[in-house]
Interface confidence: low
């Protein structure tokens, strides 16, 4: 059914990670010839919603007044013009936080670490979870997943960093989640400030696996090494 029309652009305001109960607006922008916009949500009957275009007809608004679990998921949009339906937009993943109680984030042995040494960030949840995410503020690639191998649910994940350099310093938060829906996250943990001392002359560490070929030092907050203790957890770079 997809025609030769260019695909629309899909985005969410104020963003794609929304706290439970907050409002979010999904925008789909097509062309001035658009007559109708359609939003599809994966694993839901299509279309999930239809909207007439807003003047000057090149976009449509889909409103979610109060975010709940039902709205979390993967969306695509299309527009219809006189010559048919467009190709689908790139997917938008709408994530809800606040689905579970907040985990605790701590640094072992200490959040004050000397450059060249090792530190482990420990994310502990109140209930057993099978996915943990570590996020560094203002990082281009902020998400590090630890996901259990066999669906085993546990209370903690360890994010080892070694050797530590100035790149690792900054503010971290973690989330926990159940693998059956990675669109539902816990409340964020309280922030943890990792302070790296004596790092002015440090060379950049080599990551144990490639993170992003285009990323510079500030885009690579985490370079975990070694195995994950309690190993049912598998490391994923996102």
């Amino acid at each position: 059914q997809a025609g030769p029309l260019p695909k629309p652009t899909l985005w969410a305001e104020p963003g794609s990670v929304i706290s439970w109960g907050n409002s979010v607006t999904i925008w789909c922008q097509g062309t001035l010839e658009a007559r109708e916009y359609r939003l599809d949500k994966e694993e839901s009957p299509a279309p999930w919603d239809r909207q007439n275009p807003l003047e000057p007809k090149n976009k449509a608004r889909f409103s979610i007044p109060s975010m709940t679990e039902d709205y979390a998921g993967r969306y695509r949009c299309y527009y219809r013009s006189p010559v048919g339906w467009s190709q689908p937009s790139d997917p938008l993943e709408l994530v809800m936080t606040g689905a579970y109680s907040k985990p605790t984030l701590s640094a072992l042995p200490s959040p004050l670490v000397t450059s060249g040494k090792s530190v482990t960030l420990l994310c502990q949840s109140r209930s057993p979870m099978d996915t943990f995410l570590l996020i560094k503020e203002r990082a281009a690639h902020p998400l590090l997943h630890l996901r259990s191998e066999h669906g085993a649910q546990q209370h903690q994940a360890e994010f080892p960093m070694s050797p530590v350099t100035s790149v690792h310093g900054g503010t971290y938060r973690c989330f926990s989640s159940h693998g059956f829906s990675h669109y539902l996250l816990s409340h964020p943990s309280d922030p943890l400030e990792l302070i790296v001392s004596g790092s002015l002359e440090d060379p950049r560490p080599s990551p144990t696996r490639s993170v992003s070929t285009a990323a510079g030092p500030e885009d690579q907050p985490l370079m975990p090494t070694g195995s994950v203790p309690h190993s049912g957890l598998r490391r994923h770079w996102e």
Epitope: T68, G98, P128, A152
Partner: antibody, heavy 117, light 107 residues
Framework: EVQLQQPGPELVKPGASVKISCKAS????????MHWVRQRHGKSLEWIGH????????VYNQRFKNKATLNVDNFSSTAYMELRSLTSEDSAVYYC??????????WGQGTTLTVSS | DIQMTQSPASLSASVGETVTITCRAS??????LAWYQQKQGRSPQLLVY???TLADGVPSRFSGSGSGTQYSLKINSLQPEDFGNYYC?????????FGAGTNLELK
């Protein structure tokens, strides 16, 4: 002081349903999971499931998935467990318990359920 | 599911004695273990969590130990109020499960 208040004994007929309440006080209700635990006469304890009052999310022991439904009323700080299609096998004491993590630091006094015709 | 095997099933002891109750998990539960005391006709009371941390108000004669799959609860210098049933419970993964219990009775 944390308190979990449960009603007295319930006598119900086979095939019926019952809803057991657990009124919490002395702490912020939405901050802790509320668990439910069953104890048959002279037997050990069985974990039924828990609910996170902040948003109603539940986790069930698969053994009780088709037997129990958990919900909460945050305005009254009360948790509820509905048990359906009751048989004599469901006769037991049912406890609500506050979950600090996955251990239970405060328990209700228990509600004795007797299923009999 | 992780199974908890508790032993002994029953135990007779006298006031002033020291007793130990053990619990074995069918898998590694990484110290996510709690111990409860339950007296006849009463609700269980938390004694120990995280395998070795005493709950608020629990006398120091109680102590928990262990790691991996093997855990124990030790009661030094038994007091009259210590007699009753004791249960272990893991909370490492769903579903949480309890041991079958140990009935500690006065000899």
């Amino acid at each position: 002081e944390v308190q979990l208040q449960q009603p007295g004994p319930e006598l119900v007929k086979p095939g019926a349903s019952v809803k057991i309440s657990c009124k919490a006080s002395g702490y912020t209700f939405t901050d802790y999971n509320m668990h439910w635990v069953r104890q048959r006469h002279g037997k050990s304890l069985e974990w039924i499931g828990h609910i996170y009052p902040y948003n109603g999310n539940t986790v069930y022991n698969q053994r009780f998935k088709n037997k129990a439904t958990l919900n909460v009323d945050n305005f009254s700080s009360t948790a509820y467990m509905e048990l359906r299609s009751l048989t004599s096998e469901d006769s037991a004491v049912y406890y609500c318990a506050r979950g600090a993590v996955g251990y239970f630091d405060h328990w209700g006094q228990g509600t004795t359920l007797t299923v009999s015709s | 599911d992780i199974q908890m095997t508790q032993s002994p099933a029953s135990l007779s002891a006298s006031v002033g004695e020291t007793v130990t109750i053990t619990c074995r998990a069918s898998g590694n539960i990484h110290n996510f273990l709690a111990w409860y005391q339950q007296k006849q006709g009463r609700s269980p009371q938390l004694l120990v969590y995280n395998a070795k941390t005493l709950a608020d108000g629990v006398p120091s004669r109680f102590s928990g130990s262990g790691s991996g799959t093997q855990y124990s609860l030790k009661i030094n210098s038994l007091q009259p109020e210590d007699f009753g049933n004791y249960y272990c419970q893991h909370f490492w993964s769903y579903p949480f499960t309890f041991g079958a219990g140990t009935n500690l009775e006065l000899k």
